[in-house]
Amino acid sequence: YDFTNCDFEKIKAAYLSTISKDLITYMSGTKSTEFNNTVSCSNRPHCLTEIQSLTFNPTAGCASLAKEMFAMKTKAALAIWCPGYSETQINATQAMKKRRAAKVTTNKCLEQVSQLQGLWRRFNRPLLKQQ
């Protein structure tokens, strides 16, 4: 999916008002210095591509993020403010229902959510030069 035509300001507002808080809740009890940010993004569409991938694609050691509250809210924001995104999710939703992975917070998941926090922060500061 190409995130170029999303309403970035409305997605940013949703992140600042609610998604960011859910990410913090998920990471509670973890030191902010515990994980290094290894995933980066260069502009807003690229950031959303990386955010979608890390949030919804199961990875080795972390298969369950899609059921978390921040993930549900991310999915809603993309469906509402990214033209045509919802139709790409029809089949994905069916597949996710079949998988039904249990919610398990592993260290790998915490690391992944830490990366997500970094990607979202970068999404909110699109004019900053890449380090």
Epitope: N5, D7, K10, A13, A14, S17, T18, M72, K73, K75, A76, A77, A79, I80, W81, P83, G84, S86, E87, Q89, I90, T93
Partner: antibody, heavy 120, light 107 residues
């Protein structure tokens, strides 16, 4: 089963405001956005806007910007649509309709409609 | 804003006949089109979602097709209860919009 029950008909004077309610039951309220669609007598359907409880935010049709406010009360699973500075051409049936925001993505259940008449 | 244009405005047919309703979008919207039926004094009822996907409880004489800019709702054999107004809607991008409607009336 899923039900959306709207408040009763209203008669208002030009310049006044109206607040229509829509009580939902039979599903998880926060899994769906609540959209508002109106239909003037003998006319087609016009999307007014939506409130998304999951994100606690709204998005409105520019045609109504500044005149409309959509809210929800999640404790009672009720959505509200307030339209201000009413004009005679706001006379219409106002519908609420739910739409999934993490699945479904379509207006699959509608309220029965609320007739708002604006007349001096 | 995406404009949906429905044709014809009115379709006069007899029970048992086939009805073909058209909906054209002002720009490509992939398959983000849904079809609704509305009878006098009633709320719209969802018939088809995402251009061609059937809805539970809707008779299989209703079918949809199309993608991009051109979409079609087909009623294979009209029943007396099918005479109503039909609307297409796009949810590709905000603001969501509806076509102006096609009235299917008894000939």
């Amino acid at each position: 089963q899923v039900q959306l029950v709207q408040s009763g008909a209203e008669v208002k004077k030009p310049g006044a405001s109206v607040k229509v309610s829509c009580k939902a039951s039979g599903y998880i309220f926060t899994d769906y956005a609540m959209h508002w669609v109106r239909q003037a007598p003998g006319q087609g359907l016009e999307w007014m806007g939506t409130f998304i409880p999951l994100l606690d935010t709204s998005d409105y049709n520019q045609n109504f910007k500044g005149r409309v406010t959509m809210t929800t009360d999640t404790s009672t699973s009720t959505a509200y649509m307030e339209l201000r500075s009413l004009r005679s051409d706001d006379t219409a049936v106002y519908y609420c309709a739910r739409m999934g925001v993490t699945h479904s993505y379509v207006m699959d259940a509608w309220g029965q409609g609320t007739l708002v008449t604006v007349s001096s | 804003e995406i404009v949906l244009t429905q044709s014809p405005g009115t379709l006069s047919l007899s029970p048992g006949e086939r009805a073909t309703l058209s909906c054209r979008a002002s720009q490509p919207i992939s398959i983000s089109v849904h079809w609704y039926q509305q009878k006098p004094g009633q709320a719209p009822r969802l018939l088809i979602k995402f251009a061609s996907q059937s809805i539970s409880g809707i008779p299989d004489r209703f079918s949809g097709s199309g993608s991009g800019t051109d979409f079609t709702l087909t009623i294979s054999r009209l029943e007396p209860e099918d005479f109503a107004v039909y609307y297409c809607q796009q949810t590709f991008s905000l603001p969501y919009t509806f076509g102006q409607g096609t009235k299917v009336e008894i000939k």
